[in-house]
């Protein structure tokens, strides 16, 4: 499965939109910084097969979409930017779903895929827990926005490596 060039553009657009969504200066939230322990090894496209990489990308975008589709998220961000951001993510999910079916097949996800997917889920669970603990404060959301920009950058790099493999 060849991810269309539009997929990569969509990822870049999503990153730009997420950058524009910032409402407060990150410097005013330095005390709220948190290490969410991004599973960097899951974004190393050299260490696993294409099917596994696509599964990781899909889970990453799905969890990002879920995170920004909550009521708490709606209250935190400017509505039109949030809608555009969600639309970009939704389009990427559609692109990736076609690839997941083609690459991984409709059979049960292999063990390695499962392990990578669970690493991504645990990462997002930590982000969600952090927001709950900080009562969805503006600074908590700002820290999370910066973290998701970082994880989307990892996703973009993984996509680039996938295309080079093709």
């Amino acid at each position: 499965c060849d991810l269309p060039q539009t997929h990569s553009l969509g990822n870049r657009r999503a990153l730009i939109l997420l950058g524009q969504m910032g409402r407060i200066s990150p410097f005013s939230c330095l005390k709220d910084r948190h290490d969410f322990r991004i599973p960097q090894e899951e974004f190393d496209g050299n260490q696993f097969q294409k099917a596994q990489a696509i599964s990781v990308l899909h889970e990453m975008i799905q969890q990002t979409f879920n995170l920004f589709s909550t009521e708490d998220s709606s209250a935190a961000w400017e509505q039109s930017l949030l809608e555009k951001f969600s639309t970009e993510l939704y389009q990427q999910l559609n692109d990736l779903e076609a690839c997941v079916i083609q690459e991984v097949g409709v059979e049960e996800t292999p063990l390695m895929n499962e392990d990578s997917i669970l690493a991504v889920r645990k990462y997002f669970q930590r982000i969600t827990l952090y927001l709950i603990e900080r009562k969805y404060s503006p600074c908590a959301w700002e820290v999370v926005r910066a973290e998701i920009m970082r994880s989307l950058s990892f996703s973009t790099n993984l996509q680039k490596r996938l295309r080079r493999k093709d």
């Epitope: 322990r37 669970l118 889920r121 645990k122 669970q125 827990l129």
Partner: antibody
Framework: EVQLVQAGAEVKAPGESLRISCKVS????????ISWVRQIPGKGLEWMVK????????IYNPSFQGHVSISVDKSITTVYLQWSSLQASDTAIYYC???????????????WGQGTLVAVSS | DIQMTQSPSSLSASVGDSVTITCRAS??????FHWYRQKPGKAPELLIY???NLQTGVPSRFTGSGSGTECTLTITSLQPDDFATYYC?????????FGQGTKLDVR
């Protein structure tokens, strides 16, 4: 086959220290949270603490924080629960459990160890 | 903490009967409700997760429903193996909490 095999029963005196173990096999150890659950004989279940074996990130039930500690040894795929000073009220069966995490980030306990009975008595 | 209250605390039934156990949470837990069965002298085992999903290998006579603050476990056509204690659990908020248990015994 997923297995969580716990150490045998322990009889201890108040004030003693203790570490009980849970050896897991049949899956990738670092992929799933592991929790400990307490059951006082004839009573209900209480969740104590969970750990991510990947990096030892832990979340405690405040009721148990400071009294017990959880740790892992990745090299032998084993999770531990430790007390530095046991009390009579720690007498219970302790279960280690594996969490599954769904796409909507719902945790549930899909595999349980057989339990370790800890009896604390003078 | 989120309190989980099961009702009834105990009930008697016969093989072949149907029974329903209810669990109420002190605040909404969405669908983060799970049900476990514990046979005497054994570890608990998962029956239902996320309120209504049957765990692999669990017979279809077990069904779960509900969300928010209330969920139910229904067992149809009771088998001898089903006489045990049943626990509900929430994993929506920390600390995770269980109901006090419902003991199902033979009438």
């Amino acid at each position: 086959e997923v297995q969580l095999v716990q150490a045998g029963a322990e009889v201890k005196a108040p004030g003693e220290s203790l570490r009980i173990s849970c050896k897991v096999s049949g899956y990738t150890f670092t992929s799933y949270w592991i929790s400990w659950v307490r059951q006082i004989p004839g009573k209900g279940l209480e969740w104590m603490v969970k750990i991510d074996p990947r990096d030892s990130y832990t979340i405690y039930n405040p009721s148990f924080q400071g009294h017990v500690s959880i740790s892992v040894d990745k090299s032998i795929t084993t999770v531990y629960l430790q007390w530095s000073s046991l009390q009579a009220s720690d007498t219970a069966i302790y279960y280690c459990v594996r969490h599954y995490l769904t796409q909507s980030l719902v945790d549930y306990f899909d595999h349980w160890g057989q339990g370790t009975l800890v009896a604390v008595s003078s | 903490d989120i309190q989980m209250t099961q009702s009834p605390s105990s009930l008697s039934a016969s093989v072949g009967d149907s029974v329903t156990i209810t669990c109420r949470a002190s605040q909404s837990v969405s669908n983060y409700f799970h049900w476990y069965r514990q046979k005497p002298g054994k570890a608990p085992e998962l029956l239902i997760y996320s309120a209504s999903n049957l765990q692999t290998g669990v017979p279809s006579r077990f069904t779960g429903s509900g969300s928010g603050t209330e969920c139910t476990l229904t067992i149809t056509s009771l088998q001898p193996d089903d006489f045990a204690t049943y626990y509900c659990q929430q994993t929506h908020g920390y600390p995770f909490t269980f109901g006090q248990g419902t003991k199902l015994d033979v009438r």
